[in-house]
């Protein structure tokens, strides 16, 4: 059985490891094992002995029996997936295997899709754990009940003062009010 000595993949990405075997092991079960030592490694996933793909969590294994190779795919890679793994074949007597080192590297924040989901909602607005859900709710409450009325009062007062010095046609007044409101809401959408 032969496989790559080292494979590298990005955090949150995936790697596929291809291991080749002799034709006489075609219908034997294939497996993927984790641990520095061959004798004590932990089997994470096994094939069925057929060509059918098997999935388990972030792992999948597919045996291409015609090509005498099987593929293991590790998805949603994490830093702590970095370890020694083994491609193995289940057979009578001692199983066959070859060692594969998997190295997961960090991807810069700018090239990786980040999530702002946190473990639970918080109420204090602290940046280390504030829930985005709560943030949105608080912002809209503030907008609807405080900022918009305050803005309307302000716009009304300004226009009233303007009107007292010169008569403004009603249509123009409506247009001024709407464009002021639009620009305020747009600014808020850009920077909550």
């Amino acid at each position: 059985i032969q496989g790559p000595a080292l494979v590298r993949g990005p955090e949150q990405g995936s790697v596929t490891v291809q291991c080749r075997y002799s034709s006489r092991w075609q219908t034997n079960k294939k497996w993927w094992c984790r641990g520095a030592s061959w004798s004590t490694c932990r089997v994470l996933i096994r094939s069925t002995g057929s060509e059918k793909e098997t999935k388990s969590g972030r792992l999948s294994i597919r045996d291409n029996q015609k090509n005498h190779s099987f593929q293991v795919t590790m998805e949603m890679l994490r830093q702590n997936d970095t370890d020694t793994y083994w491609c193995g074949i289940e057979k009578f007597g001692t199983d066959r295997g070859t060692r594969v080192k998997v190295n997961v590297y960090s991807v810069g924040k700018d090239t990786m899709s980040t999530s702002n989901q946190l473990p639970w909602p918080t109420v204090d607005g602290s940046t280390d754990m504030v829930s985005s859900d709560l943030q949105k709710r608080t912002y809209y409450m503030l907008l609807v009940f405080v900022k918009v009325p305050a803005l309307l009062i302000l716009v009304g007062a300004v226009l009233w003062l303007k009107r007292s010095t010169q008569k403004v046609p009603e249509e123009q007044w409506r247009h001024t009010l709407c464009s002021d409101l639009d620009s305020e809401l747009l600014a808020k959408d850009i920077s909550p």
Epitope: R78, Q117, P119, P121, T122, S126
Partner: antibody, heavy 118, light 111 residues
């Protein structure tokens, strides 16, 4: 309303693997994180991990690294807990939990009993 | 990790009387004026049920005879007047940081 429905009881032998499912309904699955809590017979509650349902990334408590795997099937709105190389001390009821928009653990699955015995 | 110590481990209270359960944290679970300490009730064969969140706020649908108080490291759950259906185990839990932890539980028996 938010509901979490877990798979049925499991009886396993030491060394075997168990996979428990937790199917969520009544909300957008990726809106809230998912947590797992262990309760051994006659004992208290122990937090195991939380999973970011947007990315599938789990954050483990120290006691639950290694043999425990937490995963998601977002399209099926389901969270999974897999325990490998089962030991007698894994005998417990496992709960999936979500906070929803509450500040405490407001929504619990009914629990899945796992018994490990030779 | 923050350790939560509940006392007493068990108590028996007569119907209509007051039950008081204490929860002490090994370090403060408060931040910016909020205490990330919650109380749960668990009956045999059931999952826990959230009663009180943020130390003193009553969860929707929970009877007003349940109340919580405290801040920093010392918290109390009061049940008054105690009813027969309140026989259960009560747990405090913090989520000030990861990992969140639970108290050891207090078993309430109704006399």
């Amino acid at each position: 309303q938010i509901q979490l429905v877990q798979s049925g009881p499991e009886l396993k032998k030491p060394g075997e693997t168990v996979k428990i499912s937790c199917k969520a309904s009544g909300y957008t699955f990726t809106d809230y994180s998912m947590h797992w809590v262990k309760q051994a017979p006659g004992k208290g509650l122990k937090w195991m991990a939380w999973i970011n349902t947007e990315t599938g990334e789990p954050t483990y408590a120290d006691d639950f690294r290694g043999r425990f795997a937490f995963s998601l099937e977002t399209s099926g709105r389901t969270a999974y807990l897999e325990i490998n190389n089962l030991r007698n001390e894994d005998t417990a009821t496992y709960f999936c939990v979500t906070y929803g928009s509450s500040y405490g653990m407001a929504y619990w699955g009914q629990g899945t009993s796992v018994t490990v015995s030779s | 990790d923050i350790v939560l110590t509940q006392s007493p481990a068990s108590l028996a209270v007569s119907l209509g009387q007051r039950a008081t359960i204490s929860c002490r944290a090994s370090k403060s679970v408060s931040r910016s004026g909020y205490s990330y300490l919650h109380w749960y009730q668990q009956k045999p064969g059931q999952p826990p049920k959230l009663l009180i969140y943020l130390a003193s706020k009553l969860e929707s649908g929970v009877p007003a005879r349940f109340s919580g108080s405290g801040s920093g490291t010392d918290f109390t759950l009061n049940i008054h007047p105690v009813e027969a259906e309140d026989a259960a185990t009560y747990y405090c839990q913090h989520n000030r940081e990861i990992p969140p932890t639970f108290g050891g539980g207090t078993k309430l028996e109704i006399k």
